[in-house]
Structure formats: structure tokens, C-alpha cells
């Protein structure tokens, strides 16, 4: 039976041109992670396999970093980069469970514009 | 339990437009996941054509060009998809399935066959 | 896109016996592969996903390994009811492709 739960960090926001840590915490099981996806709905970004360590996609080598932790995260954003994002935990015996977070990237006068009012 | 139920015309002419429907029962479309297109010319392989997110955004196979069109209509928990310009090349059977996550098919509706023919 | 390779195209083998079907991808995947049975007249079956991980339901004959460019579907010891047309698919990026099926026939 699949006991646990997946903790992200919801709906964020960050600066284009700017960076964000993408972190999800499994919790409530004793279950084993061995594999940790990290995708948007048509692209895999990343994987941390216990064995095999980080793999990330091509086309996000240059803004990427594993960490921290199963976490990831993305530098350089644009406002391209605002969607969904999921955290997919490969775990025994469970099986898999999935997270999700919401990035919106905002215009740098939008996000200095919001910090005045 | 999640089903999935393919249904439209089993023959289309030439330079004419397939439409199908895939029925979802047992799962909201609008809720997760995205639901996907796949085909299967008889006796050959699988070829993915696309899906409509939960969200309502579309992806498309390339290769299939501007040709296909995956829309969805959440009153009648249905998507559907139309490939326009068919030729004899297009007959196949057509699935629908969800995609899960990570992006494999466990869910399949059992097909339906669309033969383009005059 | 990325193209997926399968070997052999057929495969003749007796109940029993143990088999492994292959998958080359044209770039590295990372784990990211899933395997399929398929049954004439049938939509296929999900089998196998990241590559190892056993999908729910399938009995533990079945397993899969491999990573970056290289994937193995082996059944351990063969029963009546597996003799089918297996796929690989990879689930890294949009376009989803699939091999082009290994047909398992009884010898």
C-alpha cells in the first residue's frame, strides 16, 4: 500500500533572468527512493538514479544544476520556462509517486513593480 | 477504474479529414495527465501522434506536419482528433491512451480501425 | 527525433526457456524507456518503465535494465500466455517513439 505523501513547495514565482531551487520531500513511508525524475509534461529535465548518479537533458545542460539534495535547480530563467514542472519518485516497494510545482517567471519591472504596492 | 473508448468512422476517402473520439469513463480529463493519440498501421509499429494535456495545451508529432489536430470537450469528458489530407498511408488502428507519469501508456482504449480507401 | 532499434525482429523459443529482447536508442536516454506486450487484435500492455521498474500488476518474470543507449526486456522463463509482440518506447521527450516490435513465437 502506498502510504506516503509528496511535499513540494506549490506555486512559485521567480525574476526572469534569475534562478529557482525546484524541491520535493517524500514523506510518511519507509519506502526506498531509487530513482528521482524531474519533467514537464513533454520533456524529461533531469533524473537522479541512486546508482548512476545525475542525468541532465541536453537541452537544459547549460541552466541546470542536480541539487540540492533530489532537488533541481534552474538559472538563466525566461519567461519560456513558466509551466508546470513534476517530481516523479521511484520507490520500493511503493512504487511511484509524483509532485507538482507551478512556476511562473515574471518580467523583471513586473516582479520590482509588484514589490511596491 | 479508468476506461478509455475510441469511436468515429471505420472508412474515410482520400484527401478527406479522419475524425475520431476517445470516451473517457472512470477519471476526469480536466483533472491530470494528458491523453494521447497513437496509431498502428496493420501488421507495423506504433507511432504516437500527440496528446491535449489536462491543462489544454496540445502536443504533435512532427512528422505528421500541420495535419493533425487534437482538441478535447470537457462537458462530454471526450477528446478527439482530426488528421486532414489522409491518404491510403494513414489506415490504421487508432488508439487513445493516457499518458502517466513518467510518460508511459498504461491506460489504452482497445482501438479502432480507420481504413482510407475510395 | 529519437529513433529506438529493437533486436531481434523475431524470436522463436520454447516455454520455458529464458529470453532477452533488445533496444538501442539513437541518443542517450538516461533511463527513461518502456516496454509493451502486445497481443493480436489487442492494444498493447504496459510491462516495464524507467527502464526496470515493473509496472503494476506484471509478474516478476518480466524484468528490464539498461541505461543511456542501451535497454534488455528479459523474461525469466516463458509461459504459453507470453508469446506476443513486445515494444520499446522511450518516454525521455516529445515525439514518443517505439521500436519496431519483436514478434516471440513458440518454436
Known amino acids: 500500500m502506498m502510504t506516503g505523501t509528496i511535499e513540494t513547495t506549490g506555486n512559485i514565482s521567480a525574476e526572469k533572468g534569475g534562478s529557482i531551487i525546484l524541491q520535493c520531500h517524500l514523506s510518511s513511508t519507509t519506502a526506498q527512493v531509487t530513482q528521482v525524475n524531474w519533467e514537464q509534461q513533454d520533456q524529461l529535465l533531469a533524473i537522479c538514479n541512486a546508482d548512476l548518479g545525475w542525468h541532465i537533458s541536453p537541452s537544459f545542460k547549460d541552466r541546470v544544476a542536480p541539487g540540492p539534495g533530489l532537488g533541481l535547480t534552474l538559472q538563466s530563467l525566461t519567461v519560456n520556462d513558466t509551466g508546470e514542472y513534476f517530481c516523479i519518485y521511484h520507490t520500493y516497494p511503493d512504487g511511484t509517486y509524483t509532485g507538482r510545482i507551478f512556476l511562473e517567471v515574471l518580467e523583471s519591472s513586473v516582479a520590482e513593480h509588484g514589490a511596491r504596492f | 477504474q479508468v476506461q478509455l473508448q475510441e469511436s468515429g468512422p471505420g472508412l474515410v476517402k482520400p484527401s478527406q479529414t479522419l475524425s475520431l473520439t476517445c470516451t473517457v469513463t472512470g477519471y476526469s480529463i480536466t483533472s491530470d495527465y494528458a491523453w494521447n493519440w497513437i496509431r498502428q498501421p496493420p501488421g507495423k509499429g506504433l507511432e504516437w501522434m500527440g496528446y491535449i494535456s489536462y491543462s489544454g495545451s496540445a502536443r504533435y508529432n512532427p512528422s505528421l506536419k500541420s495535419r493533425v489536430t487534437i482538441s478535447r470537450d470537457t462537458s462530454k469528458n471526450q477528446f478527439s482528433l482530426k488528421l486532414s489530407s489522409v491518404t491510403a498511408a494513414d489506415t490504421a488502428v487508432y488508439y487513445c491512451?493516457?499518458?502517466?507519469?513518467?510518460?508511459?501508456?498504461?491506460?489504452w482504449g482497445q482501438g479502432t480501425l480507420v481504413t482510407v480507401s475510395s | 527525433d529519437i529513433q529506438m532499434t529493437q533486436s531481434p525482429s523475431s524470436l522463436s523459443a520454447s516455454v520455458g526457456d529464458r529470453v532477452s529482447i533488445t533496444c538501442k536508442a539513437s541518443?542517450?536516454?538516461?533511463?527513461?524507456v518502456a516496454w509493451y506486450q502486445q497481443k493480436p487484435g489487442q492494444a498493447p500492455r504496459l510491462l516495464i518503465y524507467s527502464a526496470s521498474y515493473r509496472y503494476t500488476g506484471v509478474p516478476d518474470r518480466f524484468s528490464g535494465s539498461g541505461s543511456g543507449t542501451d535497454f534488455t526486456l528479459t523474461i525469466s522463463s516463458l509461459q504459453p500466455e507470453d508469446f506476443a509482440t513486445y515494444y520499446c518506447?522511450?518516454?525521455?521527450?516529445?515525439?514518443?517513439?517505439f521500436g519496431q516490435g519483436t514478434k516471440l513465437e513458440i518454436k
Open positions: 541518443q542517450d536516454v538516461s533511463t527513461a
Open positions: 518506447q522511450h518516454h525521455y521527450s516529445t515525439p514518443y517513439t
Open positions: 491512451a493516457r499518458k502517466g507519469y513518467p510518460a508511459y501508456f498504461a491506460y
